[in-house]
Amino acid sequence: GPVWRKHYITYRINNYTPDMNREDVDYAIRKAFQVWSNVTPLKFSKINTGMADILVVFARGAHGDFHAFDGKGGILAHAFGPGSGIGGDAHFDEDEFWTTHSGGTNLFLTAVHEIGHSLGLGHSSDPKAVMFPTYKYVDINTFRLSADDIRGIQSLYGDPKENQRLPNPDNSEPALCDPNLSFDAVTTVGNKIFFFKDRFFWLKVSERPKTSVNLISSLWPTLPSGIEAAYEIEARNQVFLFKDDKYWLISNLRPEPNYPKSIHSFGFPNFVKKIDAAVFNPRFYRTYFFVDNQYWRYDERRQMMDPGYPKLITKNFQGIGPKIDAVFYSKNKYYYFFQGSNQFEYDFLLQRITKTLKSNSWFGC
């Protein structure tokens, strides 16, 4: 069955049951996600606007899918397996009486079960498992996943120690001068450089030592966390931001309406599900898209892919690859490639690496 092909997953609570305080709903859902993040490399972040991976909905009766709820009792909730659109979404029957305790239906316990489905788990035949198909109240203060639940989820995502690249369990601000720091995406925006990581971005103004950290949502509330690639076309005052199979267009620092759009509108084949890194070269008026160990070249004037791509990164960028995390263009001469905590200054005219740096070298660390 399907799984999320990333470790950083967003959720959004679309609406709140009147049965509970909003804070109690937030807490129950947050703790339910935490149950699964404790035993996997997955990290969950709540967003309040825009498109989340997992939408949490309280609804009664017919509510926009094929599986209308049935009134009090019976079906308590359902959730869709990982995927785009409705994929991952968890629906809770508003005709139940949702609670923080043993009376009515406990939201936390039900949410743990449904989030299991949202992550790709099916039902378990072990009556002690939270993924057993029938609801049974257990003391939420001593609640633990069964061995079967843990085995199931780790068979899909592995255990927490496989998450060395995401050392940020509580979404706190990453330490800027951590020698192991890596970035999700980097791009110039005018005379500034934006460094994206999780929910955050750092702003480096050229030639100034000072850097400021910001929440992505504080600048662009409609954008998701975990931006994976970015590039700028400075002459048009445009910045393109990528996450999963979607991209957003920012013009003059403002998000354009009618976005996100599919990355496939650039002409990528179906198997491309996300972009690792992207960079625009104004000399050639071409954008380079890096996906796993390959790259594509896109003609921004003709708005189409150049023929003969993809090509292997290692073949055409000597010393770079096989995969990269981020890249940006600077000084009319260099690409700066980021791989984990390392960075490579690459002269695209000489076609070779001219300097090796730490990824956070821009911050005077």
Partner: antibody, heavy 122, light 103 residues
Framework: EVQLLESGGGLVQPGGSLRLSCAAS????????MHWVRQAPGKGLEWVSG????????IYADSVKGRFTISRDNSKNTLYLQMNSLRAEDTAVYYC???????????????WGRGTLVTVSS | DIQMTQSPSSLSASVGDRVTITCRAN??????LNWYQQKPGKAPELLIY???SLQSGVPSRFSGSGSGTDFTLTISSLQPEDFATYYC?????FGQGTKLEIK
């Protein structure tokens, strides 16, 4: 390449029966919800029925409930629609369509067959 | 029960025009709305899913927006191959369709 090919349509009298088939190829059939959608001549689209990956759950439009039965044979990569007690208003092109995979039907139909025409007339 | 109302039912436009088709639900369907294009004698094709996500291979002149009860499909600059019938859909319910014709 994903392909869905319907067959079994034809002319049938009111009250008669017909069995439609949809042969799937180019993808792993068993994890997907599958559906039938129909279109009467010159009219819009109407969802008819859907079936879960295992075949254990079936759903129907009110207009066909009790008369039509959807089924599937995952070993043959084939979807079926058994239509009984046919009426003139069942005259339509019948399309099979693939839904998202998983425990629940999403209604996101990413691939469709070309359709097969069913005409109910005396 | 949920109902979908699509408008207009037909529309005449010229190549290069910007065209908007709307779809309204009688209750919130969140972003669970898809758009399909159908040409005469052909099967429908998925254009937009989840209200605003462009299906793979669909030109970027097509875009979708909306959530809750009100949704729109926009074609930014009509091409000759875009003249067809468009349907919005949510689970088992389709809109009545909008026939887009050449002016």
């Amino acid at each position: 390449e994903v392909q869905l090919l319907e067959s079994g349509g034809g002319l049938v009298q009111p009250g008669g029966s017909l069995r439609l088939s949809c042969a799937a190829s180019g993808f792993t059939f068993s994890p997907y919800w599958m559906h039938w959608v129909r279109q009467a001549p010159g009219k819009g689209l109407e969802w008819v029925s859907g079936i879960s990956p295992s075949g254990g759950e079936t759903i129907y439009a009110d207009s066909v409930k009790g008369r039509f039965t959807i089924s599937r044979d995952n070993s043959k990569n084939t979807l079926y629609l058994q239509m009984n007690s046919l009426r003139a208003e069942d005259t339509a092109v019948y399309y099979c369509a693939r839904d998202i995979w998983g425990a629940y039907a999403s209604g996101l139909f990413d691939y469709w067959g070309r359709g097969t025409l069913v005409t109910v007339s005396s | 029960d949920i109902q979908m109302t699509q408008s207009p039912s037909s529309l005449s436009a010229s190549v290069g025009d910007r065209v908007t088709i709307t779809c309204r639900a009688n209750q919130s369907i969140y972003t669970y709305l898809n758009w399909y294009q159908q040409k005469p004698g052909k099967a429908p094709e998925l254009l937009i899913y989840a209200a605003s996500s462009l299906q793979s291979g669909v030109p970027s002149r097509f875009s979708g927006s909306g959530s809750g009860t009100d949704f729109t499909l926009t074609i930014s600059s009509l091409q000759p191959e875009d003249f067809a019938t468009y349907y919005c859909q949510q689970a088992g319910i389709f809109g009545q369709g909008t026939k887009l014709e050449i002016k």
